[in-house]
């Protein structure tokens, strides 16, 4: 289907391929292979959903996600003395978010300019590979973090070097797995020139031949193996965690821990409901419809779901906040435009001068660099 009788190919609901080069003539462009999309697809590619809504969301994700994940990675690498497994998983989560978010200015420009990709084939492949890589990395590291949180409640043993090494090993295995499963996204030609719209799309229009069966099988496999199975593990870990916390003794400290655990569970649940479930479900439905009907009627929903999946880069910092004392302190102080060092100095001076209760309670509310995992 890549090359029809007349060496031409058609897209179906943003699917299809021009297999060949194009060259500019006096007026317009002459393409060696005909490529056309259906009218609905064309309306999506030229409509406000992709040219206004998407860039707005991606701008928010970039503006929030870049500094918060950047700070998180810095805190976990350089400001956390004990590298607990949770810290290791969160550092990887932050790294995955950063690797995806750094490409967003190109993605924003692409959508603002009417879904016209001008940055070349290689950059498009990198952007798409990192886009999906981030989503599946986030799911897997979130699963590891969730299982680890439950493990800490069941076995509240001290930090051991062995546990940290296991966490590092698991993290490396996850990166390797994601690299392997996203290889098809790097290998496949992702850019395509659509003569009717005079635009070159990146990933929005894909080779028909590939899509009919392969894309459906690919995303179905990912949805089962890298979404459903980890989601089941995460849910199980949190259900067991809630049971454990309910049955445990209720002193002031454990009540605080319980509240934070519930906040963490709600955050992760929100992430699954907003980011991971809609995108994975619609990826499968979208490609199933293309496979069976030749066009997808859920394209608009699919595009919104994929867009919302990037919000995980904004939600992840809340996870860090509820899990890590160090990140919590740095986040609070960053928002109050203070450094932890300044707060420590304030604390020392306030303690030595034996200030009023109000002052000391104020200073203590935003300090402490101790960690409890």
């Amino acid at each position: 289907t890549i090359q029809g009788t007349n060496r031409s190919s058609k897209g179906r609901s943003l699917i299809g391929k021009v297999d060949g080069t194009s060259h500019v003539t006096g007026k317009g462009v002459t393409v060696e292979t005909v490529f056309s999309v259906d009218e609905f697809s064309a309306s999506v590619l030229t409509g406000k959903l992709t040219t206004v809504f998407l860039p707005i969301v991606y701008t928010i994700v970039f503006v929030v996600g870049l500094p918060s994940n950047g700070m998180a990675l810095w805190v976990f690498l350089f400001r956390t003395k004990k590298k607990h497994p949770a810290v290791i998983y969160m550092a990887n989560l932050a790294l995955a978010d950063l690797l995806s978010v750094i490409w967003f200015p190109l993605k924003i420009a692409y959508h603002i300019h009417g879904n016209n990709w001008i940055y070349g084939e290689a950059l498009c492949n990198v952007l798409i590979g990192f886009f999906y890589g981030n989503m599946y990395c986030s799911i897997l590291f979130m699963t590891c973090l969730s299982v680890q949180r439950y493990w800490v409640i069941v076995n509240p043993m001290g930090h051991s070097r062995k546990k940290a090494n296991i966490a590092i090993g698991i993290s490396l295995a996850i990166w390797l797995l994601i690299l392997l499963v996203t290889i098809p996204l790097y290998v496949v030609k992702q850019t395509i020139f659509i003569p009717a719209l005079n635009i070159t799309t990146c990933h929005d229009v894909l080779p028909e031949q590939l899509l009919v069966g392969d894309m459906f099988n690919y995303f179905l496999s990912l949805a089962i193996g890298v979404f459903l199975f980890p989601a089941f593990l995460t849910a199980s870990a949190y259900v067991l965690m809630i049971r454990m916390l309910r049955s445990s003794a209720m002193d002031e400290n454990s009540e605080k821990k319980r509240k934070r655990a519930i906040k963490l569970i709600v955050t992760v649940l929100a992430m699954y409901l907003i980011c991971f479930t809609p995108s994975n479900l619609l990826l499968v439905v979208h490609y199933f419809l293309i496979k069976s009907q030749g066009q997808s009627h859920v394209y608009a929903l699919y595009i919104v779901a994929l867009c919302l999946s990037t919000l995980n880069s904004c939600i992840d910092p809340f996870v860090y906040y509820f899990v890590s004392h160090d990140f919590r302190d740095h986040a609070k102080n960053a928002l109050l435009c203070r450094s932890v060092r300044t707060v420590k100095q304030m604390q020392v001076s306030l303690t030595s001068k034996k200030h009023s209760r109000k002052s000391s309670s104020y200073s203590s509310s935003s300090t402490t660099v101790k960690t409890s995992y």
Epitope: S8, S9, R12, L197, N198
Partner: antibody
Amino acid sequence: QVQLKESGPGLVQPSQTLSLTCSVSGFSLSSYGVIWVRQPPGKGLEWMGVVWGNGNTAYNFTLKSRLTISRDTSKSQVFLKMNNLQTEDTAMYFCGRWRGFKDYPFDYWGQGVMVTVSS
Amino acid sequence: DIQMTQSPSFLSASVGDRVTINCKASQNIYKYLDWYQQKLGEAPKLLIYNTNSLHTGIPSRFSGSGSGTDFTLTISSLQPEDVATYFCLQHNSGWTFGGGTKLELK
């Protein structure tokens, strides 16, 4: 109403260039594409090429090296130029209107012009 | 490359007859098949597009069905003015025409 009309020489010498014009009315060439199709005597139809509403063009792979499609939107005319004609290029040549999208058919066609390649 | 096989090549029927013309694609073309009517010395005329959608001004006796690889044009009650050559066109991947069916009156 929508109308397309092909015009050009009925007889062309082998190795010469064929020039055909498709004059349209009832629609804008900026909004619609125009396709060229030919039908050799007693044979089936063959798609030749297309010019989109934005001026982009594409050609049948087998004719690509000999074919050029252009247009003049102000005159509502589309032109087909094919060089190095051979006797097997003898056919009825049609132009048709196309919206430019995959799910649209060639909804209106011209009457066609018979071109004979002979010395 | 998608090949379109149209059958029969010739068809003779009487006025009032139910006539069916078939078109078979070499691979799945989903719904992207159109039917055209061409009378001698006239421009081809669109009858049915996207398998079963009737073009404006076309009598309701013409109908289309099928999906995937097998498609059918049906004339429920043949009229004298329906004498013509009918051909199918796939536009799922490029454009390929069927060989045509010449319909005449008995």
